[in-house]
Structure formats: C-alpha cells, structure tokens
C-alpha cells in the first residue's frame, strides 16, 4: 500500500524509480530542480529555488561567514571585540555544534544497530567488506596524491617558514611524544570499551610517567580515560549488537523496531537542525577568521604548504573520487555532490565528520536516493574509519617537514609514509587528539623531526576544515557506490538480498509535503516474507 503522492500546484504527480529500486513520488519539475537541473519558466525557477533553498542558504552562509570574519578582522578582530564580545559573536556557531553533537550518539548507535540488524549476515559481510575496500583504496590514493604533490611542489624546500630561528620550529615539548605501539594498542582498547556509558564521552589514552627504578629513570606507560567520545568503540558495539539482535529472530524484532523508531525520531530532529545550519555555519567560519592572528603572516610563511594541502584536497574531491564514482556507477558524480552541498558546507564550518553525520544521512537518503539501511550502516563507519583528507594532509605534512629539515626521502621512506598515513588515519578516530598525534606517528616511523609540528598546528584550523570536507565526501560517495552495487546485485537476483526490518508504523501515514528532496521509500518484507511493500516515509521539516 502506497501513500498518496504529494501534489504540486498543477496537481501533477510522478512516480520515478530511486537509486534503491523503490518509487519516489514527486512532481517531475521538482525532481529536475532538486537534482540541480535546468530551471526554465518562472514557476520552475521558483520551484528550483525552493528545492535547493537550503543548499543555496548554506553556500551563502559560508561566503557571508568569510566576508563577516574578514570585516571584523579588518576592524580590529578579536582584540577589538574583547573576550566577552568574541564569545557572543561565536555563540550561534557554538550552538550549531552543540546541536549536532547532541544528536551524534543516538544517531550513530541507533542507525548502526538498525542497519546491522536489517541486513542478513551474508549481505552485511559483503557490504562491509566492499565499504572497507573502498575506504582503504581511496585513502591510499589520497596518501599517494599527497606525497606526489608535495614532492612536485616542494612546499618545504624553499619555505620561509623556517626563516626565523629554532623558536619558529616550536618547542619540542609541545609535540606529542607517544610510542607508535602504544597508539595502536590504545586504538585496540578503544575498539573494545570497558564501559559503554563512559564510551559516550571518554576514550582510553596512554600517557607516561617517569619512575625511578633501581637508580635509573624509566618511562612507564600509564593508561587513563580522557575527555572525548570513543566513537570507534560505540560503532563496533552497535554493529555487533545489531547482528546479535538479528540472530534472535522474532524475539529481537521489538528492540529492532525500537531502534528504528528512535532513529526516525532523531532524523526528524536533524531535519529541524538543518534549517539552523546556515546561521551556525556563518558564525563558525566568521568566528574562526576573527580569532586568527596574523593570517597574512601565516600565509606568507606557510602559503605553499597550505596550497599543497588544499590543492590535493580539491584534486581528490573534485576529480579522483568523482571519477571512481562515475567509473562504477556511470552516473553524474557532480549531481550527487550537489545533493550533499549542505553537509559539505557543515563539514567546513564545524570541522567535524561526526557532527556532519546527521545532515549527511538526511541528504544522501533524500537527495541522492541512497537506501536507509545502506546510509545508516555505511556513513557512521565511514565517519569513523574513512579519512581521505586526513591521510592526504598527513602525507603532505610529512614531506613538507622532510623538506623543511632537509632530510631526503628514499623509496622505502615514501612507502612507509603512505602505509603509515593510511593505517593511522583509519585509526585516528580511536586515538584521542587524532590528527596531530597520527602525524607524529608518521614522522616517528621515518625518523623525521617532530619539532615542526607546531607549524602544522598553526594552520590546522584551515587545513582541517578542508580535510573534513574531503572525509565526509568520501563517506557519501562510498554510500552511493554501495547503493549502486546493491541495485545491481538485487536486479540480478530474484530474491532481494537486503531486507529491512519493518518499523511499528502505519503503512499509510498522511503525507507531509517536503521541500528537502524526494520522500524516501523503504522496502519492507511482507508478512509472509514474499511480497515487497513500499511505504513512503515523510521528511518532517
């Protein structure tokens, strides 16, 4: 049974297959507009604007944020504002971050439990394996691109970053000093949290204490819980718990329905937060620019390094990833990217993959037709382990530091950088203070000095935003690719491989008109397990 389609002003309705093989019901014009297609008549332009309003508002917000930030900086910046006014200035942005972070925990846990429970173990394994393969290959490509660009552009060879003194390199004591082995052991410990409740806000980290043992000072590793959500542990637990619920069969169905309903309610909250996102993004971007001192000097000293990172991110995000997507799907990757402009801008504003997760789920499902059981299973995993941007930046940074300190990189060292960057970026989510610490791990692996990490930190506020955009773009395109893989395997087999557990919801709810893309349809197995019932899920805005 299918709900009545939402009707446009002319009363026309259209049914079109979505990427997940269901039927999306919307006006033909709206579909074209939503996809960023041609808008002809005034009526179509109006509809086009309405369908893309949030995207346009978000883009405007980023531009306005930059302009506002530069304006305030020009008028004296943080010094002129003073701490109190600066705090008030960044408050709208802080509010967005808090709203998004508030939603992460229920969203990740419920979506993964629901996602893992809705797939049969064979499909789950295949889907997971393909996802991890995609994430690994793209991260390795990003690493290779980073090394290649840095070797070609040589940002450190003629850099003015080192022209002052040893002091310019920063105090070595500020550089994280942690054994490579301990970093990976911490990663493993965080995968298996000892306390699920504390994992929601704490992670395990090894620090060191110097102890006097028989007259000699020995550095002893000491484990402790530090502030910061252990997202890796929660992700692993949620997947395993979802699989366990599925194993229970009918007994587990009630709990699966509970998590699915919880997830739906969370997504409703997300759809509300989305409309506040442009305001928050504007002030986040503006606030960061205002907070920065001597931006000009920073660009003069580290301009080539910044250029190298941003250029690498642009090439990977606008050429490499779209090309991979096109080769496997034969679909326009830029249309897909247009559908996720809002989460991409949010990634730039918040500089957090996990904070962008709620909006990304909403957009890939509603704008790009990715099935819920795919997006809600793959995206949280991607946000945790897929770090193309981080891997690329770390490789550029490692080569930059090698050039800066005039240390040559032979083939073995380059391969070591590639492998370590790929491995440590995957594990970064499980390592507190991930970015800088993983860079320190790479530098340690090839015996490069860690002194210059403080230079990298000085521009991290900008490079990290670019990293996050690339990270989340990779997650989304991965979800799109997997959707395509599922579509092909489903069309080949008569028996659908991927089954979603039915939520305890009426099958014909009253449709609520939506502007943010097409209403998403879910596949439900009929009671007898043979008939597939399509049910429209409204998007509450």
């Amino acid at each position: 049974m299918v709900a009545d389609p939402p009707r446009d002003s002319k009363g026309l309705a259209a049914a079109e297959p979505t990427a997940n093989g269901g039927l999306a019901l919307a006006s033909i014009e709206d579909q074209g507009a939503a996809a960023g297609g041609y808008c002809g008549s005034r009526d179509q332009v109006r509809r086009c604007l309405r369908a893309n309003l949030l995207v346009l508002l978000t883009v405007v917000a980023v531009v306005a944020g930059v302009a506002l930030g530069l304006g305030v900086s020009g008028a004296g910046g943080a010094l002129a504002l003073g701490p109190e006014r600066l705090s008030a200035f960044v408050f709208p942005g802080e509010l967005l971050l808090r709203l998004l972070r508030m939603i992460i925990l229920p969203l990740v846990v419920c979506s993964l439990i629901g996602g893992a429970a809705s797939l049969d173990p064979g499909a789950l394994g295949r889907l997971g394996a393909w996802a991890l393969l995609f994430f690994l290959v793209t991260t390795l490509l990003a690493s290779a691109l980073g090394v290649g660009l840095a070797l070609a552009l040589q940002p450190g060879a003629a850099s003015a970053a080192i022209n002052a003194s040893v002091g310019a390199a920063g105090s070595a004591e500020n550089a994280p000093s942690k054994e490579v082995l301990d970093s990976f052991l911490d990663l493993a410990r965080n995968i298996f949290p000892s306390n699920l409740v504390s994992a929601a806000f704490r992670s395990y980290s090894t620090t060191y204490e110097e102890r006097n043992i028989t007259g000699t000072r020995v550095k002893v590793p000491v484990g402790q819980e530090v502030e910061g959500m252990n997202i890796l542990g929660l992700v692993v637990f949620a997947i395993v718990f979802g699989v366990a619920l599925r194993k229970l069969g009918p007994e587990g169905e009630l709990l699966i329905r509970f998590f699915n309903s919880f997830n739906e309610a969370t997504m409703v909250l997300v759809s509300w937060i989305m409309w506040y996102a442009p305001v928050g993004i504007m002030f986040l971007v503006a606030g960061k620019i205002v907070e920065m001192e001597d931006v000009g000097l920073l660009f003069a000293r580290l301009g080539k390094y910044i250029l190298c990172c941003l250029l690498g991110h642009a090439i990977h995000g606008l050429l490499v990833l779209p090309l991979i997507y096109f080769l496997f799907t034969r679909k326009n990757p830029y249309r897909f990217l247009w559908g996720i402009v809002t989460p991409l801008a949010t990634a730039f504003g918040t500089s957090s993959s996990s904070a962008t997760l709620p909006l990304m789920m909403k957009c890939v499902e509603e704008k790009n037709g990715v099935a819920k059981h795919i997006s809600r299973f793959i995206l949280p995993i991607g946000a945790t382990v897929n770090m193309d941007g981080a891997a690329l930046f770390q490789c550029v940074a490692a080569v930059f530091i090698a050039q800066l300190s005039q240390q040559s990189l032979d083939f073995v060292k380059i391969i070591t950088i590639l492998v370590t960057a790929t491995a440590s970026s995957v594990g970064a989510a499980g390592i507190p203070a991930g970015g800088v610490l993983t860079l320190a791990i790479i530098l340690e692996a090839v015996n490069l000095p860690v002194d210059h990490i403080s230079l990298i930190l000085a521009v991290d506020w900008l490079v990290d935003r670019s990293c996050t955009v690339l990270n989340v773009e990779g997650d989304a395109l991965g979800a799109g690719l997997l959707q395509n893989y599922v579509d092909r395997t489903e069309s080949r087999s008569t028996e659908p491989e991927l089954i979603q557990v039915k939520s305890e919801l009426p099958l014909d709810p009253l449709p609520v008109p939506t502007e943010e893309g097409n209403p998403l349809l879910k596949h439900y197995r009929g009671p007898a397990g043979d008939a597939t019932v399509a049910s429209e899920k409204e998007s509450v805005m």
Partner: antibody, heavy 120, light 107 residues
Framework: QIQLVQSGPELKKPGETVKISCKAS????????MSWVKQTPGKGLKWMGW????????IYGDDSKGRFAFSLETSGSIAYLQINNVKNEDTATYFC?????????????WGQGTTLTVSS | DIQMTQITSSLSASLGDRVTISCRAS??????LNWYQQKPDGTVKLLIY???RLHSGVPSRFSGSGSGTDYSLTISNLEQEDIATYFC?????????FGGGTKLEIK
C-alpha cells in the same frame, strides 16, 4: 671522499667583522644542510644553527641571533659564517658540520675547525 | 633545551681494556643519541648515530647502547689511536645539544 675544509685561524679586535668559510667536496652540496658548532674551552660544544643549503634559508639557535649570519655560495659549494661586531666571548673554535640525513639531527662530517681569537 | 650530562669528565684505562662512557639526557630522547670523537689535534669524527649504528669507516670495537634517558658508548679493546675526548649529542629535538665530553687517557 667527503671533505669540509675551513678557512684559517683569525685574530680580530672587538667590534670588527669576521667571515669564516667552509668548502664542501665529495657530495652534492645542496642535498644536506650545513650546521655551525662553537667550541669554547669552558663551555664545550654548542650548536649555533644551520643553513638550508637548497633554499639558502638560515636557522639560528637562540644564542646566535643578531650578530651572526649564515650564507652560501652554492656554485662553489661554500658555506659562510659571519660574525659582526665581534666580542671577547666570541673567542672559540668554530666548526662547520654536515647535517646528516635520516635520523633527525646529527652531523656526519666535520670541518677541521677555525680558531677565532678576539683581543684588543 | 635538553641537557646532556657526561658524569665522567676524564677516564684512564690501559690498552686492550674495555671502556664504557656514559651519557644521560634530561628527558627521553627516543634513541636519537650520537657519539663523536675529538682527537687531540681538534678534528671531530662521528662514531655512532641513533644509539647503536656505526658510522661508515668506524672500527667495530666501538658500540653504543641505551634507551630513554640513559646511554653509553663502549670501546671493547682500547687502542692507542682511541685516545681522544668523546662527546654525546641528542638529536631528537631542536636545538641539538652536546654533553660536556669525556677525556680518555692511557694509564
């Protein structure tokens, strides 16, 4: 083989300028950084800083800022240490040392040293 | 800055002896410890880098060991040509710093 040959001993009056040279041979000069190390009888060896031989950018140690200048003549594979307005405490032996590759900060080849005596 | 301490400023030994010179850092230097030999004529040579790696052309009687903050240089079979002053140097962080030196003499 790799060699670093420094200029001869110098005797200067306070306030004068001295320029010590270090000619490298046996390797590609612009591949390795060149460091300068000061040795005084009372204080031992002290790293003064180094020069990035590819870019010509000097990096000075905390005690070497101001009167000290590192420079290069890349075509002749020569590194220079110039001390302006010399003082009595500059009396020491100055070594140029090739900054090695691969294990952070160490110096695999050293010049024979140039003795600077500052006396009025 | 990291302080490097060579407790023994001078050491007397007989030819053929096994001599150990120690060096201590004020903080963990992660094995980035190097040893240099300065002959009486003033020439300086690298002996060992990264705690235990022998520089090319250095006789195998020289060896290095240690970790964390404590390191040592060992000459297994002292020869006449080994009479010199030995310096340790940390290369972990800028600025690189040297120990005060240990002068080795023949008994």
């Amino acid at each position: 083989q790799i060699q670093l040959v420094q200029s001869g001993p110098e005797l200067k009056k306070p306030g004068e300028t001295v320029k010590i040279s270090c000619k490298a041979s046996g390797y590609t000069f612009t591949t390795y950084g060149m460091s300068w190390v000061k040795q005084t009888p009372g204080k031992g060896l002290k790293w003064m800083g180094w020069i990035h031989t590819y870019s010509g950018v000097p990096i000075y140690g905390d005690d070497s800022k101001g009167r000290f200048a590192f420079s290069l003549e890349t075509s002749g594979s020569i590194a220079y240490l110039q001390i302006n307005n010399v003082k009595n405490e500059d009396t020491a032996t100055y070594f140029c040392a090739r900054r090695s590759d691969g294990y952070r900060y160490f110096f695999d080849y050293w010049g024979q040293g140039t003795t600077l005596t500052v006396s009025s | 800055d990291i302080q490097m301490t060579q407790i023994t400023s001078s050491l007397s030994a007989s030819l053929g002896d096994r001599v150990t010179i120690s060096c201590r850092a004020s903080q963990d230097i992660r094995n980035y410890l190097n040893w240099y030999q300065q002959k009486p004529d003033g020439t300086v040579k690298l002996l060992i880098y990264y705690t235990s790696r022998l520089h090319s052309g250095v006789p195998s009687r020289f060896s290095g060991s240690g970790s964390g903050t404590d390191y040592s240089l060992t000459i297994s079979n002292l020869e006449q040509e080994d009479i010199a002053t030995y310096f340790c140097q940390q290369g972990n962080t800028l600025p690189p710093t040297f120990g005060g030196g240990t002068k080795l003499e023949i008994k």
